[in-house]
Amino acid sequence: KKEDGESTAPTARPKVLRCKCHHHCPEDSVNNICSTDGYCFTMIEEDDSGTPVVTSGCLGLEGSDFQCRDTPIPHQRRSIECCTERNECNKDLHPTLPPLKDRDFVDGPIHHK
């Protein structure tokens, strides 16, 4: 069987990474620190009332490339930043909400002329 790091992409880190977690701490976290084979992240998004909420934590290697790509989601303002350069590197990530577009002010199928 292949050992860690010998498999095909995505390439596993040779060692576990520790990240700060907030509002996103898994059961195996301790003292707001989680562990991962992937990335640390910090994310900002609007809740249902439009209030910005910051969460941070760990992303596993599987699928994290996609999750860390900050692809816009229609009708949802959010931004995510990921890092791997050191333990708890996400303490220093400060993503900001993308600016409101005109259409974000409008509900339903009403369009500006």
């Epitope: 060692k15 195996d28 991962t36 760990c58 596993g60 333990n87």
Partner: antibody, heavy 116, light 112 residues
Framework: QVQLQQPGAELVKPGASVKLSCKAS????????MQWVKQRPGQGLEWIGE????????LYNQKFKGKATLTVDTSSSTAYMQLSSLTSEDSAVYFC?????????WGQGTTLTVSS | DVVMTQTPLSLPVSLGDQASISCRSS???????????LHWYLQKPGQSPKLLIY???NRFSGVPDRFSGSGSGTDFTLKISRVEAEDLGVYFC?????????FGSGTKLEIK
């Protein structure tokens, strides 16, 4: 090949401190965590804590906080564990071990004897 | 802390026999990444432990294929298909899913 060299034995007096060393070779020192494990005669293994040599980030077993302090010297690829306020309960074999997601390689261990 | 319970404490075997060691954890060892960080080590008298099996069932480099690991969640087993003299010693299971990492109390494999 991976080697973790530890002194064979240390004899210290109660109340004193000791700094145990672990010299790593055969791999990139900063690419793996270094863990420390305690084994008392005829007893099991106890995890003390770990240090990431790339940023000196440490995690400790709550039980050993205040007792053990982990440090590294990356220039010599050496990890250290200082044990303070020693008592007979600290007499044990102390292993350093290379850790990625599990302990892959262990040092031979240092036998610490605390005695007046 | 996660308690690792190993059985039996002592396992007398004849050379060539199959040996089986059980390890139970007090909570699930499935990590949030999906990996299960349960490992097996062998410690011979006067030596440091050596890694045999990592992440439940993966043999470490140089470990003979007579060693195999299985299990999931909280129940794990190490099997030695045909015990050889060099296999004698104390076997420990260990988990690195939850901090602090913990070890089983050990199973002593000895000649009957």
């Amino acid at each position: 090949q991976v080697q973790l060299q530890q002194p064979g034995a240390e004899l210290v007096k109660p109340g004193a401190s000791v700094k145990l060393s672990c010299k790593a070779s055969g791999y990139t020192f900063t690419s793996y965590w270094m863990q420390w494990v305690k084994q008392r005669p005829g007893q099991g293994l106890e995890w003390i804590g770990e240090i990431d040599p790339s940023d000196s980030y440490t995690l400790y077993n709550q039980k050993f906080k205040g007792k053990a302090t982990l440090t590294v010297d990356t220039s010599s690829s050496t990890a250290y564990m200082q044990l303070s306020s020693l008592t007979s309960e600290d007499s044990a074999v102390y292993f350093c071990a290379r850790f990625g997601y599990y302990i892959e390689y262990w040092g031979q261990g240092t036998t610490l004897t605390v005695s007046s | 802390d996660v308690v690792m319970t190993q059985t039996p404490l002592s396992l007398p075997v004849s050379l060539g026999d199959q040996a089986s060691i059980s390890c139970r954890s007090s909570q699930s060892l499935v990590h949030s990444t999906g990996n299960t960080y349960l490992h097996w080590y062998l410690q011979k008298p006067g030596q440091s432990p050596k890694l045999l099996i990592y992440k439940v069932s993966n043999r470490f480099s140089g470990v003979p294929d007579r060693f195999s690991g299985s299990g999931s969640g909280t129940d794990f087993t190490l099997k030695i298909s045909r015990v050889e003299a060099e296999d004698l010693g104390v076997y420990f299971c260990s988990q690195s899913t939850h901090v602090p990492f913990t070890f089983g109390s050990g199973t002593k494999l000895e000649i009957k």
